[in-house]
Interface confidence: low
């Protein structure tokens, strides 16, 4: 069974699926429609690089410029360097600014929803 | 609603090269990428390549790469489409498509048809 | 690249009859897969999409199912107006391809 005959089984079940298995199907040329992609867990998809979701969704990806103001592809989005979501040529805007580090204070962001930037 | 307006007929001599446009209107224009779609008379369908919806990235049929150029001009939605060095083989109807989010080509414009003849 | 096989050209049918069209693709594409119908002189109209979601506004005869490689769309009591060109689309991977189409005729 290749990736996307698989995708096609577990498709009603990834609402729950963990990073994990996120970062697994993106390797399966499993072509994620946008609808499924929605519908994932906020804080599965964060993890997630520009380069996994590129591939995790194939084609589809250019579904996040009509979705960047939704959840969980907004909150996807601040989370990358804004040079990393440039290389999507899609136009998606609010990524970290380039210089800025990005230091994972799991308080922090729990308390703001966006992680902690240090300027350049 | 979303309308895709595309530019007359073209009637070029071989080694020409002719530049159709598309103009959207009914919707952000950069918000959706711009697809173009070659039919030959009687013919199926092929995909030549979109271009993104800020118009600073294409992606092509790599059959299309030497022949086919697009661009966009944001201040008057209007994609373009250059159309090279013609041949017979280059006369078809050029369709752009707009993709949906969820569907590839919900929205097309009319075509334009493009003769190439000596 | 990816090949999408329609295997009929034509198709006779009558006005009430149930027909189907199928597609075959040279490897899986899951369920990314759209049928579109042309009139001569017009654009192609999304019937279908991710294999089997009727697109807003299409008239429930038109039915598309098949996962993986082989895909059917079914016209059920076919009407005079559906007397077209069917193609299937994957978008499963770049390029995106296209059928060569099946031309549905009156018997």
């Known amino acids: 069974m290749n990736g996307s005959e698989y995708f096609v089984k577990i498709q009603s079940f990834l609402g729950g699926a963990p990073t994990e298995d996120l970062k697994a199907l993106s390797q399966q040329n499993v072509s994620m429609d946008l609808a499924t992609f929605m519908k994932l867990r906020t804080d599965a998809v964060l993890p997630l690089t520009v380069a996994e979701v590129q591939k995790l969704l194939g084609p589809h990806v250019e579904g996040l410029k009509a979705e960047e103001r939704h959840r969980p592809v907004r909150d996807w989005i601040l989370r990358q360097r804004q040079d990393d979501l440039d290389t999507l040529g899609l136009g998606l805007q609010g990524g970290i600014p380039n210089g800025y580090l990005v230091l994972d204070l799991s308080m922090q962001e729990a308390l703001s929803g966006t992680p902690c930037l240090l300027g350049p | 609603q979303v309308q895709l307006q595309q530019s007359g007929a073209e009637l070029a001599r071989p080694g020409a090269s002719v530049k159709m446009s598309c103009k959207a209107s009914g919707y952000t224009f950069t918000t959706y990428t711009m697809h173009w779609v070659k039919q030959r008379p009687g013919q199926g369908l092929e995909w030549i390549g979109y271009i993104s919806p800020t118009g600073d990235f294409t992606k092509y049929n790599q059959k299309f790469k030497d022949k086919a150029t697009l661009t966009t001009d944001k201040s008057s939605n209007t994609a373009f489409m250059q159309l090279s060095s013609l041949t017979s083989e280059d006369s078809a109807v050029y369709y752009c498509a707009r993709w949906n989010g969820t569907v590839w080509f919900a929205y097309w414009g009319q075509g334009t048809l493009v003769t190439v003849s000596a | 690249d990816i090949v999408m096989t329609q295997s009929q050209k034509f198709m006779s049918t009558s006005v009430g009859d149930r027909v189907t069209v199928t597609c075959k693709a040279s490897?899986?594409?899951?369920?990314?897969v759209a049928w579109y119908q042309q009139k001569p002189g017009q654009s192609p109209k999304v019937l279908i999409y991710s294999a089997s979601y009727r697109y807003s506004g299409v008239p429930y005869r038109f039915a598309g199912g098949g996962s993986g490689t082989d895909f059917t769309l079914t016209i059920t009591n076919v009407q005079s107006e559906d007397l077209a060109e069917y193609f299937c689309?994957?978008?499963?991977?770049?390029?995106?391809?296209f059928g060569a189409g099946t031309k549905l005729e009156l018997k």
């Open positions: 689309q994957q978008y499963n991977n770049y390029p995106l391809t």
């Open positions: 490897q899986a594409l899951g369920t990314n």
